[in-house]
Interface confidence: medium
């Protein structure tokens, strides 16, 4: 899967202890679950569950492990190579426009508007007008619009594989 | 809003290499992860490489490890993608993509991104 970064993924300098295991960079890069050393020469092992990274890189750390948010449950833990897996506990949904949080999906239609989508973890209930059968064009995005991730990995933001 | 345009693409003979660029616009760069993806003919848009901000580190898939470098230029406001020894198989629209928030963690290529519109890239004898 995809990969992009930022600043509050990165984990706070760790001096290799001697439980980190080396091993030497591939043209300059290290493999999924580790990063590479300051001087450029040793590739040094993500802590598990502290810390991973998920492809080849020249990271001077690994990327801190994410939290579930409460509200939120843990789907898989964090591994040197993959991140926590986090979803929307039942009955709430992340949205793509505000990944940061689950909201609470709607209990019913508007009227004059039947439900043919249920709340799961990426969507809310999906309305269509019962005569048109046209996809209410309020706040349920239709289903190919919401956040998605790969198979096996259930939508989440801080979701990714290696 | 961010506005990302994407240039440098074009055809090349296998071996060949090309540079990207993706001239991000509406916000500065700098604190933002961001980082380019591609998708070929009748294949999903797959990761490429990712930068994080202030040279923290680069992320390549092996696909494109040793072959490919990306870089930045944040006074520029600008990302790079250096393509070397270009095979077939790296025939795609290549797409700029930044991280919508500073607080964005790791995304998949369907999170919450900006995305520019691509620029295709061809590889063939």
């Known amino acids: 899967e995809s990969a992009l970064i930022t600043q509050q993924d990165l984990a706070p300098q760790q001096r290799a202890a001697p439980q980190q295991k080396r091993s030497s960079p591939s043209e300059g890069l290290c493999p999924p679950g580790h990063h590479i050393s300051e001087d450029g020469r040793d590739c040094i092992s993500c802590k598990y569950g502290q810390d991973y990274s998920t492809h080849w890189n020249d990271l001077l750390f690994c990327l801190r492990c994410t939290r579930c948010d409460s509200g939120e449950v843990e789907l898989s833990p964090c591994t040197t190579t993959r991140n926590t897996v986090c979803q929307c506990e039942e009955g709430t949904f992340r949205e793509e426009d505000s990944p940061e949080m689950c909201r609470k999906c709607r209990t019913g239609c508007p009227r004059g508007m039947v439900k043919v989508g249920d709340c799961t973890p990426w969507s809310d209930i999906e309305c269509v007008h019962k005569e048109s059968g046209t996809k209410h064009s309020g706040e349920v995005p239709a289903v190919e619009e919401t956040v998605t991730s790969s198979p096996g990995t259930p939508a989440s933001p801080c979701s990714l594989s290696g | 809003e961010v506005q990302l345009l994407e240039s440098g693409g074009g055809e090349v003979q296998p071996g060949g290499s090309l540079r990207l660029s993706c001239a991000a616009s509406g916000r500065s760069i700098s604190n933002y992860a961001m980082g380019w993806f591609r998708q070929a003919p009748g294949k999903e848009r797959e990761f490429v490489s990712a930068s994080v901000w202030n040279n923290g580190g680069n992320y390549y898939a092996e696909s494109v490890k040793g072959r490919f470098t990306i870089s930045r230029d944040n006074a520029k406001n600008t990302l790079y993608l250096q393509m070397s020894s270009l095979r077939a198989e790296d025939t795609a629209v290549y797409y700029c993509?930044?991280?919508?928030?500073?607080?964005?963690?790791?995304?998949?290529?369907?999170?919450?991104?900006?995305w520019g519109q691509g620029t295709l890239v061809t590889v063939k004898p």
């Open positions: 993509v930044v991280a919508r928030t500073p607080e964005t963690p790791i995304t998949s290529a369907r999170g919450a991104n900006y």
